[in-house]
Amino acid sequence: CDLPQTHSLSNRRTLMIMAQMGRISPFSCLKDRHDFGFPQEEFDGNQFQKAQAISVLHEMIQQTFNLFSTKDSSATWDETLLDKFYTELYQQLNDLEACMMQEVGVEDTPLMNVDSILTVRKYFQRITLYLTEKKYSPCAWEVVRAEIMRSFSLSANLQERLRRKE
């Protein structure tokens, strides 16, 4: 399965929506900056089978959706932009799920790189804990928005490779 061109477009739209979501100047939140340890090695894609890469991308997008669909998130971000954001994320999840089915068939569960899935989950755990420690402050959300934008940009490289890979 090759990811459709629309998937790359959706990823770009997601980045644009996240950029529009910014409400406060990042400069006013410099003191809240945090290194969440984005697991770059999981998105390099060299050591991956295609099915594993798709699983890792799916986990990242699903966790992003969950992160931004909490009550605390709804109270922070513009509702119209959030709805657009959800739509794009769902589009990407659907693309990846369609690919998964084609890669291995509906009934078959391939050997996933479970440690990669766990590594992505832990990355989002660090983000979640940061938000709870900061009591979901506007600056904390701004830092997280910037981090997720960065992670989507970095994962876009893997998505692009998947789109071209036979």
Epitope: S55, H58, Q62, Q63, F65, N66, L67, S69, L93, L96, E97, M100, M101, V106, T109, M112, V114, D115, L118, R121, K122, F124, Q125, R126, T128, L129, L131, T132
Partner: antibody, heavy 119, light 108 residues
Framework: QVQLVQSGAEVKKPGASVKVSCKAS????????MHWVRQAPGQGLEWMGE????????IYAQKFQGRVTMTRDTSTSTVYMELSSLRSEDTAVYYC????????????WGQGTLVTVSS | EIVLTQSPATLSLSPGERATLSCSAG???????LYWYQQKPGQAPRLLIY???NLASGIPARFSGSGSGTDFTLTISSLEPEDFAVYYC?????????FGQGTKLEIK
Amino acid sequence: QVQLVQSGAEVKKPGASVKVSCKASGYTFTNYWMHWVRQAPGQGLEWMGEINPSHGRTIYAQKFQGRVTMTRDTSTSTVYMELSSLRSEDTAVYYCARGGLGPAWFAYWGQGTLVTVSS
Amino acid sequence: EIVLTQSPATLSLSPGERATLSCSAGSSVDSSYLYWYQQKPGQAPRLLIYSTSNLASGIPARFSGSGSGTDFTLTISSLEPEDFAVYYCHQWSSYPFTFGQGTKLEIK
């Protein structure tokens, strides 16, 4: 509010299979991994594995690999855990628990399903 | 597999006393992935503490957690009658996820 409702108690003979269901409500079913944890009478908790209802992929504990099958039905927001080749040591209460992150990790549990394996 | 060993197996105390429950990991566990659960007879476990020291929603402030590496502690500052139950530590730092064997807190 989040609710996980499990199927009723089962009595099975050694060598048979059992299929326990867990129906979820109060949240977007496909967004969270669902886990299965069991507890033998008077014993501690034991993690069996998890399923992502969105795409159906599973991760099983090595101990249960080959004997456990976790599936889901997105149309009814239900996950299933089937355990085959039952033996007396499989007599336990089986729980489903919803994944999540931070304060949401295993914050929601089903009420439990007692599976008794006896000849 | 990370083995979690809880001690003591049973702790007999009176209401108003302080309870200290230990959880020792066979190998290092990142504190972000160490959780505590309470279970009463006939009930499902209930989340008490997440990420070593954070109180779950609705849990009274008399409960607290601490620790790092391989040694973790759950403390109940002043026992209430409803606190007598079994307590489990749990890790999801690596597969397979594991639980301690439990500490039964009983009324003296």
